[in-house]
């Protein structure tokens, strides 16, 4: 038989290797969590058999006093910095909060994470604690928050030093004044949402969806954006884990495509471009003392002096090595090999790293390409908890565990619940309802809306893939026809307060509608009646689909306009027109549904995924030019809203059960709650 | 209210040390920081050091071998102990609690370096 | 250390005026810089925190802004009672450094 092909091992230039033996690690691990301590105090100091047993029981290991291999897995694996026994100090008062509204400063931003994502991740992180307790959470902009959320990197101005990428995650003190309820996060980590970095795409045809790493193109697997399949050299990635079978693509943040800052108007780099009469083909640090890159928008910069700096490139930054912070070259030379993406080629240990220059053989610089990182929303969240006086727990399943372990599920656990409402109770039961009625006689005017189910369809936008046009989807299925029955059975599913994700929700007439397949809810709190329904929509609203995306009421002249898919319908009164096709509104052919509406100063705003459009109501037109980012102008939502609408003068974006409330004081749009539409919209009784 | 107050010897010696106190109240050292700065007549500020909640200190590198601090909580004071003085140590001495910041400043201890 | 760099010793402005003082640091302090207020005779008094933030009772006509290694003190109409030295300070990383000050004269 041949034999298998060895794999070639090389020593890396900067290759940190630890030279702590496997005892001093575990002195150095007890000691700074709290073991040895606790164990001193009972007597033995020159053993480390008792701290290796206190810690084997709080982490629930085997408990062998030995420092085995599950003990010293367990120092290995990344972690909280917050001590398991005992604390990192004595703290003033009894470490929880004697107020159960609670405020939070984001005083600074990792560079790993779009802020948008960041703002969500810790909003997010905070609703999990808000959904189990009377704790409300508020964003504000000063020092005076009660938590105060900043990343550091070592010493970082509390004492406690992080110690570079791994080991120490994070920290945070428990509740009191000062920097006790503050929440530390370690920059030197990579911050993620825990399955690779995070890089949102522009142009293609994913909608501004983040890439997905790795994905296969052409049989080969990606980790980071690529040019292969393009002549102009800039970056591309697929949305899906394989852009073969999907084509789903977007562009990658590049200075081929546009330039920040400076003073060119966001243009792309040109290259070559002449600097101190040199010629330069790439973005460049010279001339700046901040390591900022940067190029020239024009042909000649000592003549034009128009610049703008080199958007991040988080998919392909390298971390560690010896050439931290900068990017990997692509394609590159590795014992006389051509690589075009990350490799684990001659490494003992199947880490991925990539060249920064063309050529390794020759330059020797090198980084490890970026990991999986460490999610930002589970981190926070058990930081949080800290923040709100909880201590580790010893329930590897639960959320205060001091280990880091990725999960998509739920993360909080029986555990951590029993635990945050023993210091601060559960949610309040709401007053209770009268019963609904099951009779609906609406009495709101009819409103309008769309025809087609919410599925997003390809963007018909004509920027070609990487290999062509993409392939249009499927424009989902036929949508049921309405129901001809007017009265419902008593049964769960009558009720708004089952009801895990509505289709659309407005505010007509100072009261709230709850659209969900065919049927809808009205609630007011400033009526006795408060929840109304089930009604359905074709009673009321004939012409309409049993899917809705959303709906408003234009408040001077009290038309109803609703959106299903690619369709709008107008209702004035009983009287409808259409449907017609988003087309004549002004919006185009990539806009797939209008997810949500929102009044600004005399005209709408009409929103469709990450954008949202000026929406004219007399003209019923949108302004072309009016296309915005929703993060640019509204800073902390979530970048995926399913639904956007009004209510009592407050906008909201939902996502999932979640809603975020942004009020806008002196032209400033700021997250002033995030909460359950269910429980803190329509004040529904907890289960 | 937050109040920080500073006394010192206000004459010393050259070669010999120095040794400042700083007691606050209104507020907790297990709760902030409080870091020392100095400025010598006529001219600018110069950061000495500081020592955080749990205790650690950190030091200007320059200043590192002759500074130190140190605090005891339960009086809420903090203190600053500096050696072998010379003539351009000369300056007033200022403790300041901090919170993104130095929010809070005591009135200043005045040292002259002198024999 | 991080060097902090105030371009002017001096500045000469004159009641109503708009004033801008600048500071440089030597590298990145991302968004870790505190302004100072210091009066003749008194202790240094803190303006702008992290950056762009004001301090709790501090007017608003002072500013500040910046991130990185570039940063802004404005105050956009001066008043007589302005007349003071004015700090920058990182506290990024310790040894944490002040800017050399500068003396705002009121013409």
């Known amino acids: 038989a041949p034999r298998q092909r060895q794999s070639t091992l090389v020593l890396f230039p900067g290759d940190l290797k630890t030279n702590l033996t496997d005892r001093q690690l575990a002195e150095d691990y007890l000691y700074r969590y709290g073991y040895t301590r606790v164990a001193e105090m009972h007597g033995d100091s020159k053993s480390l058999g008792p701290a290796l047993l206190l810690l084997q029981k709080q982490l629930s290991l085997p408990q062998t006093g030995e420092l085995d291999s599950a003990t010293l897995k367990a120092m290995r694996t990344p972690r909280c910095g917050v001590p398991d026994l005992g604390r990192f100090q004595t703290f003033e008062g009894d470490l929880k909060w004697h107020h159960h509204n609670i405020t939070y400063w984001i005083q600074n931003y990792s560079e790993d994470l779009p802020r948008a994502v960041i703002e969500d991740a810790f909003a997010r992180a905070f609703a999990l604690w808000s959904a189990v307790t009377p704790l409300t959470f508020t964003r504000v902009y000063s020092r005076d928050a009660d938590i105060v959320i900043q990343f550091g990197v070592a010493e970082h101005g509390d004492g406690y030093p992080f110690d570079g990428k791994d080991g120490l995650l994070a920290h945070a003190f428990p509740p009191g004044p000062g920097i006790q309820g503050d929440a530390h996060f370690d920059d030197d980590e990579l911050w993620s949402l825990g399955k690779g970095v995070v890089v949102p795409t522009k142009f293609g045809n994913a909608d501004g969806a983040a890439c997905h790493f790795p994905f296969t193109f052409e049989g080969r697997s990606y980790s980071a954006c690529t040019t292969d399949g393009r002549s102009d050299g800039v970056p591309w990635c697929s949305t899906t884990a394989n852009y073969d079978t999907d084509r789903r693509f977007g562009f990658c943040p590049s200075e081929r495509l546009y330039t920040q800052d400076g003073n060119a108007d966001g243009k792309p780099c040109q290259f070559p471009f002449i600097f101190q009469g040199q010629s330069y083909s790439a973005c460049t640090t010279d001339g700046r003392s901040d390591g900022y890159r940067w190029c020239a928008t024009t042909a000649n910069y000592d003549q034009d002096k128009l610049y703008g700096f080199c958007p991040t490139r988080a998919d392909s930054t390298v971390i560690g090595g010896n050439s931290a912070g900068e990017l990997c070259v692509f394609p590159f030379t590795f014992l006389g090999k051509e690589y075009s993406t990350c490799t684990s080629e001659g490494r003992g240990d199947g880490r991925l790293w990539c060249a920064t220059t063309s050529n390794f053989d020759r330059d020797k610089k090198w980084g490890f390409c970026p990991d999986q990182g460490y999610s930002l929303f589970l981190v926070a969240a058990h930081e949080f908890g800290h923040a709100l006086g909880l201590d580790h727990t010893s329930v590897p399943e639960a959320l205060m565990y001091p280990m880091y372990r990725f999960t998509e599920e739920p993360p909080l656990h029986k555990d951590d619940v029993n635990g945050i409402q023993y210091l601060y109770g559960s949610r309040p039961e709401p007053e209770p309802r009268p019963p609904t009625t099951t009779t609906p006689q609406p009495t709101a005017p009819p409103t309008v809306c769309p025809t087609g189910p919410p599925t997003v369809r390809p963007s018909d936008r004509p920027t070609a893939g990487p290999t062509g046009p993409p392939s249009a989807g499927p424009t989902g299925p036929p949508t049921a026809g309405p129901s001809t029955t007017t009265t419902v059975p008593l049964n769960p599913v009558d009720d708004a307060c089952n009801v895990n994700i509505f289709d659309a929700i407005t505010e007509i007439g100072n009261q709230l509608y709850l659209f969900k397949d065919g049927r809808y809810w009205r609630f007011s709190e400033r009526r006795g009646s408060r929840l109304q329904g089930p009604f359905l929509i074709a009673d009321t609203w004939p012409a309409l689909p049993r899917k809705l995306d959303s709906a408003f009421e234009e408040p001077l002249s009290k038309k109803l306009f609703f959106f299903s898919g690619r369709q709008v319908w107008v209702y004035t009164g009983s009287s409808v027109l259409g449907p017609r096709r988003l087309d004549k509104l002004g919006l185009g052919a990539d806009v797939a549904q209008v997810t949500g509406a929102l009044r600004r100063g005399g005209k709408m705003l009409l929103f469709s995924g990450r954008r949202f459009w000026r929406f004219d109501v007399k003209a019923q037109m949108v302004d072309p030019r009016s296309a915005s980012e929703v993060d640019r102008m509204f800073p902390g939502v979530p970048l995926d809203t399913h639904d956007v609408f009004q209510y009592q003068e407050k906008a909201y974006f939902c996502q999932d059960r979640f809603y975020w409330r942004v009020s806008s004081q002196s032209g400033v749009n700021q997250v002033d709650q995030v909460g359950y539409v269910t429980y803190d919209i329509l004040q529904c009784p907890e289960d | 209210q937050v109040q920080l107050k500073e006394s010192g010897p206000g004459l010393v010696a050259p070669s010999q040390s120095l040794s400042i106190t700083c007691t606050v109240s209104?507020?907790?050292?297990?709760?902030?920081?409080v870091h020392w700065v100095r400025q010598p007549p006529g001219k600018g500020l110069e950061w000495l050091g500081v020592?955080?909640?749990?205790?650690?200190?950190n030091y200007n590198s320059a200043l590192m071998s002759r500074l130190s601090i140190s605090k005891d909580d339960s009086k809420s004071q903090v203190f600053l102990k500096m050696n072998s003085l010379q003539t351009d140590d000369t300056a007033i001495y200022y403790c300041?609690?901090?919170?993104?910041?130095?929010?809070?400043w005591g009135q200043g201890t005045s040292v002259t370096v002198s024999s | 250390d991080i060097v902090m760099t105030q371009s002017h010793k001096f500045m000469s402005t004159s009641v109503g005026d708009r004033v801008s003082i600048t500071c440089k640091a030597s590298?990145?302090?991302?968004?870790?810089v505190a302004w100072y207020q210091q009066k003749t005779g008194q202790s240094p008094k803190l303006l702008i925190y992290?950056?762009?933030y004001r301090n709790t009772g501090v007017p608003d006509r002072f500013t500040g802004s910046g991130s990185g290694t570039d940063f802004t003190f404005t105050i956009s109409s001066v008043q007589a009672e302005d007349l003071a030295v004015y700090f920058c300070?990182?506290?990024?990383?310790?040894?944490?450094?002040f800017g050399g000050g500068t003396k705002l004269e009121i013409k």
């Open positions: 300041a609690r901090y919170y993104y910041g130095m929010d809070y």
């Open positions: 992290s950056s762009s």
């Open positions: 020592i955080w909640t749990g205790g650690t200190t």
């Open positions: 209104g507020f907790s050292l297990l709760s902030y920081g």
């Open positions: 590298q990145d302090v991302r968004n870790t």
């Open positions: 300070q990182q506290h990024y990383i310790t040894p944490y450094t």
